[in-house]
């Protein structure tokens, strides 16, 4: 349905809070650098704009695409070149290709300093001083270190981050109440920002086909009664609600987003029976709550697979005349039958049965070629089963800290030419999935851990996309989406590697690691263990053992010394002396 | 929107042959599965033969098998029949159909079909 004014469209749908707040967002992740202020006026130009084409739609320029009105809009800013360097040549363009050129400038990794909190009275103050300011600076400052954080659930995000400042606010011990709020809303939004940017990049990278296949699998599994039209269309408008977010039409996406939801809770009763509360709840906490929505339980008394997809004659015939929807059908079969698999897995044995059939169907005997399929699915079951099964153990054996020492020292021998920086988030993220999902029981396991190292691999992808160090990373991140995570796992020593100089500056260590918080310090020390595999890969695990535990008491011993400094430099060079012979350095 | 012209019916007598020709246009012609089904006057739709997108997996109803020919030329945006030892029972009209959104795998009545042409087997 076209609108004579699409930005007028757009105002009036959203209103003009969220409108407001979208075209911040949009213009955050486009332009990372820019000061807030420069946003704001951006903003509110845009918006003034906006309500001149509500009062009147054949007003000068509001036919005009939202790209061009935003584009245009971007390119007014004064130091676009000496602030982006190439980006400013975007503005040279014409849509579609000047958004699709601002779009590949997008930097997963902006050189911006890292958010450091105020004290609680301080943040209070500025709070109550000036509410509207205070939100817009939260939303600022989020998009423009995740350029492709999910729009409309960052709105929800600071309607939670609203309601925590106006609560603790008044409370009796502020810090006590809002501290552990905010920490919650870090956590929960570093990882809604992996999960999307894994969306954005199986979109970008991979194409529609594999989002919708990842979809199909994902909502089959959460609403497996649903009938495979019902699914097929909900997949349909789920993806074009990403493409549309992933794409920078940040408006098109939260409007659609809402209709999905207002869709989906006027049929909630084929669809599934747990989205009863969540759809009580208001527009941002209601699309939130169905995106997180536990799955529904499996219709009893589900018919084997084997009827449909390897027994039936018409097999390949269904197969060649919708060959998608026939895979389609049955990765949704599949998925409803097995909540207890990845979804990355559910792809897998999809691919699997699709490359059987494409062989099979042009046989001479095709039942006889494929009547055994399903006993190909057997080791692709098995190994992330395994994987799981063993990590879980050494998880439960070393805890959380020591268990990412371990995939630290693992990736490190992999890909040794990976950024120590990015090794360390990745690993530390690695690791986390053992407090995440090993506490599960079985059936719930490898879909938390498999589907979750998917998005922290997603995270090494494009990082490295951004340098590109390693061709075992760039070979492993390219080839398929659904095997990235056994194509690392598989990865052995790079023997090819010649190891870094040794730096005695790298394991200088100063009185300041004494103030930082647990975290910061497990950071420090990660580091250092990264430095050193990469100096010495092919050290054992008892050899890096000993220098990380001689390490965390030398920490220990200098953090309670008078003279702190003095003895982080007498010290210090004893323990690299020692360091460096224990590994043969 | 989909199009699909059937033309190259016609009158031929029992053990002749005729070429059925199909021209698409609406869709992405070169991957799609392709079907000619057949109705006999006062019966139900009959499946009568697929090609795949890319002419690898061919299938044909036991009634035909042997004597018929599906091909494609995408390039050409063209399905063909080639039916050779025709017999009575083959009378009927012939429909190139395509897949359409929505609707069930092998449920024909729901294709997007042509307007068909008409194929009498007689002496």
């Known amino acids: 349905d076209a609108h004579k004014s699409e930005v007028a469209h757009r105002f009036k749908d959203l209103g003009e809070e969220n409108f407001k707040a979208l075209v911040l967002i949009a213009f955050a992740q486009y332009l990372q650098q820019c000061p807030f202020e420069d946003h704001v006026k951006l903003v509110n130009e845009v918006t003034e704009f906006a309500k001149t084409c509500v009062a009147d739609e054949s007003a000068e320029n509001c036919d005009k695409s939202l790209h061009t009105l935003f584009g245009d809009k971007l390119c007014t800013v004064a130091t676009l070149r000496e602030t982006y360097g190439e980006m400013a040549d975007c503005c040279a363009k014409q849509e579609p290709e000047r958004n699709e050129c601002f779009l590949q400038h997008k930097d997963d990794n902006p050189n911006l300093p890292r958010l450091v909190r105020p004290e609680v009275d301080v943040m209070c103050t500025a709070f109550h001083d000036n509410e509207e300011t205070f939100l817009k600076k939260y939303l600022y400052e989020i998009a423009r270190r995740h350029p492709y954080f999910y729009a409309p659930e960052l709105l929800f995000f600071a309607k939670r981050y609203k309601a925590a400042f106006t609560e603790c606010c008044q409370a009796a011990d502020k810090a006590a109440c809002l501290l552990p709020k905010l920490d919650e809303l870090r956590d929960e939004g570093k990882a809604s920002s992996a999960k999307q940017r894994l969306k954005c990049a199986s979109l970008q990278k991979f194409g529609e086909r594999a989002f919708k296949a990842w979809a199909v699998a994902r909502l089959s599994q959460r609403f497996p009664k649903a009938e495979f039209a019902e699914v097929s269309k909900l997949v349909t408008d789920l993806t074009k609600v990403h493409t549309e977010c992933c794409h920078g039409d940040l408006l098109e996406c939260a409007d659609d987003r809402a209709d999905l939801a207002k869709y989906i809770c006027e049929n909630q009763d084929s669809i599934s029976s747990k989205l009863k509360e969540c759809c009580e709840k208001p527009l941002l906490e209601k699309s939130h709550c169905i995106a997180e929505v536990e799955n529904d339980e499996m219709p009893a008394d589900l018919p084997s697979l084997a009827a449909d997809f390897v027994e039936s004659k018409d097999v390949c015939k269904n197969y060649a005349e919708a060959k998608d929807v026939f895979l389609g059908m049955f990765l949704y079969e599949y998925a409803r039958r097995h909540p207890d698999y990845s979804v990355v897995l559910l792809l897998r044995l999809a691919k699997t049965y699709e490359t059987t059939l494409e062989k099979c169907c042009a046989a001479a005997d095709p039942h006889e070629c494929y009547a055994k399929v399903f006993d190909e699915f057997k080791p692709l079951v098995e190994e992330p089963q395994n994987l799981i099964k063993q990590n879980c153990e050494l998880f439960e054996q070393l805890g959380e800290y020591k268990f990412q020492n371990a995939l630290l020292v693992r990736y490190t021998k992999k890909v040794p030419q990976v950024s120590t920086p990015t090794l360390v988030e990745v690993s530390r993220n690695l690791g986390k999935v053992g407090s995440k999902c090993c506490k599960h029981p079985e059936a719930k396991r490898m879909p938390c851990a498999e589907d979750y190292l998917s998005v922290v691999l997603n995270q090494l992808c494009v990082l490295h996309e951004k340098t590109p160090v390693s061709d075992r990373v760039t070979k492993c991140c390219t080839e398929s989406l659904v095997n990235r995570r056994p194509c690392f796992s598989a990865l052995e020593v790079d023997e090819t590697y010649v190891p870094k100089e040794f730096n005695a500056e790298t394991f200088t260590f100063h009185a300041d690691i004494c103030t930082l918080s647990e975290k910061e310090r497990q950071i420090k020390k990660q580091t250092a263990l990264v430095e050193l595999v990469k100096h010495k890969p092919k050290a054992t695990k008892e050899q890096l053992k000993a220098v990380m535990d001689d390490f965390a008491a030398f920490v220990e011993k200098c953090c309670k010394a008078d003279d702190k400094e003095t003895c982080f430099a007498e010290e210090g060079k004893k323990l690299v002396a020692a360091s460096q012979a224990a590994l043969g350095l | 929107q989909v199009q699909l012209q059937e033309s190259g019916g016609g009158l031929v007598q029992p053990g002749g042959s005729l070429r059925l020709s199909c021209a698409a246009s609406?869709?992405?012609?070169?991957?799609?599965?392709m079907v000619w089904v057949r109705q006999a006057t006062g019966k139900g739709l009959e499946w009568v033969s697929t090609?795949?997108?890319?002419?690898?997996?061919?299938r044909y109803a036991d009634s035909v098998n042997g004597r018929f020919t599906i091909s494609r030329d995408n390039a050409e945006n063209t399905l063909y029949l080639l039916m050779n030892s025709l017999k009575p029972e083959d009378t009927a009209v012939y429909y190139c159909?395509?897949?359409?959104?929505?609707?069930?795998?092998?449920?024909?009545?729901?294709?997007?079909r042509g307007q068909g042409t008409q194929v009498t087997v007689s002496s």
């Open positions: 159909a395509t897949y359409r959104a929505g609707s069930r795998i092998g449920s024909y009545e729901d294709y997007y």
């Open positions: 609406g869709f992405a012609f070169s991957t799609s599965g």
């Open positions: 090609i795949s997108d890319d002419s690898r997996i061919i």
